[in-house]
C-alpha cells in the first residue's frame, strides 16, 4: 500500500541544518572544502538518535497513547511526526520488531488522520477499526491503526541543539 500519497500530506521538506560539524570546525570553509560550524559536543541527549537536524528517542517501556504523549512532553519533545518518506525509512530501520506510538491520531468527526501538529495525513493507515484512533509504526512497513488505550512503546522527537 502507498503510505504517502502525492497529494497534500502534511510534508515539510527537511534539510540538515548546521548542527553537527567536525569537532574543531570553525565558521569558515575548512581545507577540504566543507563548510564547518561550531557546535555542541552532543547535538542530541544521551540515548537519542540524530537524523536530519532532529533527535529521536525510542522507548523500551510501554504505555497508552496519552501517557506516551505526556512522557514525550516531559522530555521537551513530542510524539514523532513521521511526515517524510526519509524519516519513515530511518525510523523503520531502528524500530525493528516492535510497535511504537507516533503522533498521528484519527479525528472521527472529520473522518481523517491528523498529525499532532494538526497537519492532515492523506496517506495510508492499515488495520483501521472503529475503536482504533491512534497509530503505530514498527513491526510492519506501514502506519498501523491501534487502540489508544493499549500500551506500546513510543517515539519522541525534538529539534537537535
Amino acid at each position: 500500500p502507498q503510505i504517502f500519497n502525492k497529494s497534500n500530506d502534511g510534508f515539510t521538506t527537511t534539510r540538515s541544518y548546521g548542527t553537527v560539524s567536525q569537532i574543531f570546525g570553525s565558521s569558515s570553509p575548512s581545507p577540504n572544502g566543507f563548510i564547518t560550524t561550531r557546535s555542541y559536543g552532543t547535538v542530541c541527549p544521551k540515548d537519542w538518535e540524530f537524523y536530519q537536524a532532529r533527535c529521536f528517542f525510542l522507548s523500551t517501556s510501554e504505555s497508552s497513547w496519552n501517557e506516551s504523549r505526556d512522557f514525550c512532553k516531559g522530555k521537551g519533545s513530542t510524539l514523532a511526526i513521521v511526515n517524510t518518506p526519509e524519516k519513515l525509512k530511518f525510523l523503520q530501520d531502528i524500530t525493528d520488531a516492535e510497535k511504537y506510538f507516533i503522533g498521528l491520531i484519527y479525528h472521527r468527526e472529520e473522518k481523517r488522520w491528523r498529525w499532532i501538529n494538526n497537519s492532515v495525513f492523506n496517506g495510508n493507515v492499515t488495520n483501521q477499526n472503529q475503536n482504533f484512533n491512534c497509530a503505530t509504526i514498527g513491526l510492519t512497513k506501514t502506519f498501523d491503526a491501534a487502540s489508544c488505550d493499549i500500551s506500546y512503546r513510543r517515539i519522541c522527537e525534538k529539534n537537535a541543539k
Epitope: G41, K46, Y51
Partner: antibody, heavy 119, light 107 residues
Framework: EVQMQQSGAELVKPGASVKLSCTAS????????MHWVKQRPEQGLEWIGR????????KSDPKFQGKATITADTSSNTAYLQLNSLTSEDTAVYSC????????????WGQGTLVTVSA | DIVMTQSHKFMSTSVGDRVNITCKAS??????VAWYQRKPGKSPQVLIY???TRHTGVPDRFTGSGSGTDFTLTISNVQSEDLADYFC?????????FGAGTKLELK
C-alpha cells in the same frame, strides 16, 4: 566553543603501557558516550570501544580486551585509553570521538594521539 | 562481527569524473552505514550517514546509496580536493566495524 583536546604523541618501548587522555570542553562528557578509534595510515579504522562516563560502563571489541582499558573522570571531563603490553602493531593514531546515540556514526573526532612503539 | 569489504584498495580517477566506491557488508545492516573521508594527517570527516543522508556542509557531489549488504558512495564531478581515503562503517551492531578503505588517486 567545543573542543576535544587529546594528549601529545608518545614514543614507548615494546612491552610498556601508555595512558592517553581526551579532555572535553564545551559540553559535559556525562551527557554522551566517549568512543576510541585506532587509525593506521596504511590500514583501516578500528573501533576499540566506548564508555558511558556517567556510570563507567564500557563496551568494547573483544579483540581489544586485555589490550585496551577505557576509563573516564567526570570531574575533569576527561576520557582515557590505556594500552598495555605494547607491540609494533599498536603503533597508530588513537582518536576519541563522542556520540550520544546508540546507532553510532562519528560526526566529531579529536585530533588524535600518535603512539609509536619502538625499541 | 560484521565484516565490511571495500573491494578496491585503490581507484584512479580524473578531475571532473564520476566515481563509485563500493562497500559490502557480510550480513544485512539495513541502512546503518556511514561513509568517511580521511586525508593524510587529518581526522576522518563523515560524509554520509544512514546510507544516503548527506552530512551538514558536505558538497552535493557526494551521494550515498544502498541498503542491506551493498552500499555505494558516488562522487560526481571529482575535484582535486576529493583525493583521499574513503571508509565505510556499519553501526547496525557492535562491535562497530569499518571497511579497509579505498584510496582515490589521480590517473
Amino acid at each position: 566553543e567545543v573542543q576535544m583536546q587529546q594528549s601529545g604523541a608518545e614514543l614507548v618501548k615494546p612491552g610498556a603501557s601508555v595512558k592517553l587522555s581526551c579532555t572535553a570542553s564545551g559540553f559535559n562528557i556525562k551527557d554522551t558516550y566517549m568512543h576510541w578509534v585506532k587509525q593506521r595510515p596504511e590500514q583501516g579504522l578500528e573501533w576499540i570501544g566506548r564508555i558511558d562516563p556517567a556510570n563507567g560502563i564500557t563496551k568494547s571489541d573483544p579483540k581489544f580486551q586485555g589490550k585496551a582499558t577505557i576509563t573516564a573522570d567526570t570531574s575533569s571531563n576527561t576520557a582515557y585509553l590505556q594500552l598495555n603490553s605494547l607491540t609494533s602493531e599498536d603503533t597508530a593514531v588513537y582518536s576519541c570521538a563522542p556520540y550520544s546515540g546508540n546507532y553510532v556514526w562519528f560526526p566529531y573526532w579529536g585530533q588524535g594521539t600518535l603512539v609509536t612503539v619502538s625499541a | 562481527d560484521i565484516v565490511m569489504t571495500q573491494s578496491h584498495k585503490f581507484m584512479s580517477t580524473s578531475v571532473g569524473d564520476r566515481v563509485n566506491i563500493t562497500c559490502k557488508a557480510s550480513q544485512d545492516v539495513g541502512t546503518a552505514v556511514a561513509w568517511y573521508q580521511r586525508k593524510p594527517g587529518k581526522s576522518p570527516q563523515v560524509l554520509i550517514y544512514w546510507a544516503s543522508t548527506r552530512h551538514t556542509g558536505v558538497p552535493d557531489r557526494f551521494t550515498g546509496s544502498g541498503s542491506g549488504t551493498d552500499f555505494t558512495l558516488t562522487i560526481s564531478n571529482v575535484q582535486s580536493e576529493d583525493l583521499a581515503d574513503y571508509f565505510c562503517q556499519q553501526y547496525r551492531s557492535y562491535p562497530l566495524t569499518f571497511g579497509a578503505g579505498t584510496k582515490l588517486e589521480l590517473k
